[in-house]
């Protein structure tokens, strides 16, 4: 059968019909509807929104829409005992206190249930002590402090600026350095773009604005009390002392007005270099402690938040496939927000809503996709990707056998400059081909393709005439699908022209000022960038669900595997003597990559030539494509990170947001010169090369002719 017959398609029911049905005005209306009150995970408001979305998806025409609930560990401030930080004098009197909440944005003064800024999952505590400024609290910042400057953070409260890396990594690093508390703040250098007004007059962060966020180090575990298994009605829960990833020291976030008051008194060592200075009018002294006049003053944290097992709700919608109903293409994004969620997540949820509506319209006209499409509105993403992870844990057997692809749909915008895509190499060609067919929304690119504006504004560092596509890291709901289950995944959004500030987010990220008005006034008044993102995300889902042959190109994996092998080899070659001493060879890895390249090339040739009218052969070839990503999964996982099982990619051990290639080898090599037992350390490098080489070779063999 042809594609049209197979999916009961009429000539007008094609990708164009689906894309033409997507409307910017609808996305705008949906965004407004989703952002009028807070939708914090675990609250009644977010449950009501789940039921509203369930009802609307049913109206839009999905075959079924169900709520999937779980009881997971969440964290909330104490309503009667607020969190704050103070400067205390020698008598213990509080001479300065940080703000208890953010000044509300215009029009929202009377909204109740705005959660004040807090670091989710911080333990309770009231530590007091001297302050040490630790820059971004990255691994390299603590190396600089401890090794070069000989500054000991043990028993100190550290203050770190947000940005560059995931906040959970900052807290982990501070804990390892012996700190007894962490203060996180937003420096204007990272969250105030020059020449732009602060909200409500522009998209910059006001001095009283604060970034919320969780500070877990879950490493893909999901609910901290039920790692590996769903947090259902009969779940066995760990005790809090055995919970995964919880921080052990109090943590609290503040804005730059309050940070100014803490940092202006800092004494001790001067900053080591200009990269440690932000934009506040303070010396950025490292400490420890305050300068002479204020040396008897200390900093005291007052943290009273509580961890509570709370019910969360995912919304799961199904559009059954006509030909291969047992093959799932998943489009998912979260629904829960820290406050109003103007960008994160509702700019993404509004796009998903419009994609569902468009698919529903086609279905009502008699069309079905070839494969089943699952739509998900995840809960509790902000508390550690909990909703998506619990659902995937509950459905892991189905997903590992039937999961074709997962497309993530969190924030549609983090700027309005150009497209940003992170995905598996299997999707490179799909993304390239799709963006060549879409119109660019960018000024100066009228009548040009999205591919052209994207390539011009964000060129690939390796291949001229092609756009940059990044590795998948984590910090979003694709994590469990890609890093744990090995389902081909991708994400797309519009981003800023701020390559140097890649992981700091937009200025109002996770603050009370992330409102509908922020988007409508400053980022995307015509909602044209939202529409483009809807076309990219929706177009990817359409192709993945409807193309006869899956739109995966295994040759692109071969190309990146060679690049990653070269990169990790060059890192190792910084230690030529040790490689010789311990007989470290990358020959097996390069050999496996060479084999993969040859087998992928032959597979691609067969893919061009086979009889697509033979459903058995078609299914066989598609299964080889679908299971290729799965073949990179090591069932034993990475060292000390059992839920990160992808051998080619994992979130960086130093920054959850960033992706690392050959992470097992990378981590074994990291800081190897400081290891107390070099023989053991280089032995682990060799073991990781072995695991990587074996996995690449095994993956290659899944593409060989089956008999």
């Amino acid at each position: 059968k042809s594609s049209n017959e197979a999916t009961n398609i009429t000539p007008k029911h094609n990708m164009k019909a689906f894309l033409d049905e997507l409307k910017a005005e609808n996305i705008k209306k949906f965004l407004y509807n989703f952002t009028q009150i807070p939708h914090l995970a675990g609250t009644e408001q977010n449950f009501q929104l789940a039921k509203q979305i369930q009802s609307q998806w049913k109206e839009f025409g999905l075959d079924s829409v169900e709520l999937a609930h779980y009881d997971v560990l969440l964290s909330y401030p104490n309503k009667t005992h607020p969190n704050y930080i103070s400067i205390i004098n020698e008598d213990g009197n509080e001479i300065f206190n940080t703000s208890l909440f953010e000044p509300p944005p215009p029009g929202y003064e009377n909204v109740s249930d705005i959660v004040p800024p807090f670091s989710a999952f911080s333990p309770q505590g009231m530590p007091e002590g001297d302050l040490v400024y630790v820059n971004y609290a990255r691994t390299e910042d603590f190396f600089k402090l401890e090794r070069d400057m000989k500054i000991n953070c043990s028993g100190k409260i550290v203050i770190a600026r947000y940005g560059k890396v995931f906040r959970g990594n900052k807290v982990k690093n501070a804990q390892l350095a012996g700190a007894k508390g962490v203060i996180l703040y937003s420096d204007p250098a990272d969250y105030f773009a020059p020449g732009v007004k602060s909200y409500p007059d522009g998209w910059n962060l006001p001095g009283g604005g604060v970034q919320r966020g969780n500070i877990l180090n879950l490493n893909g575990a999901g609910d901290p009390l039920t790692p590996g298994y769903p947090a259902n009605e009969y779940a066995y829960r760990r005790g809090i002392a055995e919970a995964v990833g919880l921080p052990s020291i109090p943590v609290h976030p503040i804005g730059y007005y309050d940070a100014q008051k803490l940092l202006e008194k800092m004494g001790g060592s001067a900053p080591p270099d200009s990269s440690w200075r932000g934009s506040l009018k303070v010396p950025y002294n490292v400490g420890p402690g305050f300068t002479g006049n204020f040396s008897t003053q200390k900093v005291k944290m007052h943290i009273h938040s509580t961890n509570e097992v709370t019910r969360i709700y995912n919304v799961i919608g199904t559009l059954r496939g006509a030909v291969e109903p047992d093959r799932y293409v998943i489009l998912g994004g979260h629904r829960d927000s820290w406050v109003f969620g103007g960008i994160d997540p509702q700019s993404g949820a509004a796009v998903v809503h419009e994609i569902v509506r468009s698919f529903g319209t086609l279905k009502k006209e008699g069309w079905r996709p070839r494969r089943t499409i699952l739509f998900a509105s995840w809960d509790a993403e902000e508390f550690g990707l909990l909703g998506s992870t619990e659902w995937a844990e509950e459905n892991s057997r189905l997903l590992q056998e039937r999961g074709v692809a997962y497309i993530n749909a969190d924030s549609s915008i983090e700027g309005n400059y150009t497209l940003r895509v992170d995905c598996t190499p299997l999707m490179y060609s799909l993304v390239h081909n799709l963006t060549k067919e879409l119109k660019s929304p960018d000024e100066g690119f009228e009548g040009k393709s999205l591919y052209e504006s994207w390539t011009k504004k964000s060129p690939s560092p390796e291949f001229s005439g092609m756009p940059r596509i990044s590795k998948l890291g984590s910090g979003n709901d694709f994590e469990v699908f890609f890093q744990r289950l090995g389902i081909a995944s991708g994400r797309a959004r519009y981003t800023k022209n701020w390559e140097t500030n890649k992981f700091s987010g937009y200025p109002l990220y996770h603050s009370v000022y992330e409102t509908y008005e922020l988007v409508e006034k400053f980022y995307d008044p015509m909602f044209k960038y939202h529409l483009t993102v809807a076309q990219v995300r929706g177009g990817m889902v359409f192709e993945l669900a409807n193309s006869i042959v899956l739109p995966f190109d295994c040759r692109d994996y071969a190309v990146v595997l060679r690049k990653y092998a070269d990169k990790i080899y060059s890192i190792s070659m910084k230690h030529p003597q040790e490689m010789k001493t311990y007989s470290v060879s990358f020959d097996s890895l390069f050999s496996a990559v060479k084999n993969f390249t040859e087998i992928a090339s032959k597979f691609s040739e067969r893919l061009q030539d086979f009889d697509k009218s033979n459903p058995i052969v078609l299914r066989m070839m598609n299964d080889q494509l679908m299971f290729l990503e799965r073949a990179f999964i090591d069932p034993l996982g990475l060292p000390d990170r059992p839920f990160y099982r992808h051998v080619i990619y994992a979130p960086s051990s130093h920054n959850k947001y960033a992706g690392e290639s050959f992470p097992g080898i990378y981590d074994a090599l990291f800081d190897i010169e400081s290891k107390v037992d070099p023989s053991k350390a280089w032995g682990e490098v060799k073991r990781q090369i072995y695991v990587a080489a074996f996995t690449v070779q095994a993956a290659a063999e899944t593409l060989s002719e089956v008999a």
């Epitope: 300065f96 703000s99 208890l100 000044p103 215009p106 006001p206 007005y257």
Partner: antibody, heavy 119, light 107 residues
Framework: EIQLQQSGPELVKPGASVKMSCKAS????????MHWVKQNNGESLEWIGY????????RYNQNFNGKATLTVDKSSSTAYMQLNSLTSEDSAFYYC????????????WGQGTSVTVSS | DVQITQSPSYLAASPGETITINCRAS??????LAWYQEKPGKANKLLIH???TLQSGIPSRFSGSGSGTDFTLTISSLEPEDFAMYYC?????????FGGGTKLEIK
């Protein structure tokens, strides 16, 4: 030196209107909000509203909706407040004051304009 | 609207003394309270904002403290030029509102 120079005292009849001015100098006029505050003789202060010259947004205290109208002339860095349908209740001192942003306190004030409503 | 209650409304003290003026908000205003000084024939002066931040150029004998609903202005070692009218004002939520004022006179 930053200054907010307000216009002179006004004696007006009930039912009439009055328009007072506040000329700013020593800073970039469009970078700061301009607020207006009422003070009844020897009594406390009441915030009337603001004009933001950066984007021409205004916000009023509901108590002054329809009573006060705030405008600016950016070319002369001057803010204006018009009060209409005047009654004896409107007899007061009126101050202009600037703030750096929406959430910031008023760091510089004018010397005030006296308005007396009397027949 | 946020109501601000200021006390006392009248205070007599001598130069060199330390005095305190209190303001209470009808609901939590975090730390967003400002203090102003008013003198006849002079423009009002911002002394303190955000509860405890001293405005540049203001002598350090002025200090502010408090958070939530209760705030205090302290003037230590009163100088002759400090005898004036003082107002507090919340600057977190529009419409901005003021306390009733405190008249500080020489004893």
């Amino acid at each position: 030196e930053i200054q907010l120079q307000q216009s002179g005292p006004e004696l007006v009849k009930p039912g009439a209107s009055v328009k007072m001015s506040c000329k700013a100098s020593g800073y970039t006029f469009t970078d700061y909000y301009m607020h207006w505050v009422k003070q009844n003789n020897g009594e406390s202060l009441e915030w009337i509203g603001y004009f933001n010259p950066y984007n021409d947004y205004t916000r009023y205290n509901q108590n002054f909706n329809g009573k006060a109208t705030l405008t600016v002339d950016k070319s002369s860095s001057t803010a204006y407040m018009q009060l209409n349908s005047l009654t004896s209740e409107d007899s007061a001192f009126y101050y202009c004051a600037r703030s750096d942003g929406y959430y910031d306190a008023m760091d510089y004030w004018g010397q005030g304009t006296s308005v007396t409503v009397s027949s | 609207d946020v109501q601000i209650t200021q006390s006392p409304s009248y205070l007599a003290a001598s130069p060199g003394e330390t005095i305190t003026i209190n303001c209470r908000a009808s609901k939590s205003i975090s730390k967003y309270l400002a203090w102003y000084q008013e003198k006849p024939g002079k423009a009002n002066k911002l002394l303190i904002h955000s509860g405890s931040t001293l405005q540049s150029g203001i002598p350090s004998r002025f200090s502010g403290s408090g958070s939530g609903t209760d705030f205090t202005l302290t003037i230590s070692s009163l100088e002759p030029e400090d005898f004036a009218m003082y107002y507090c004002q919340q600057h977190i939520e529009y419409p901005w509102t003021f306390g009733g004022g405190t008249k500080l006179e020489i004893k």
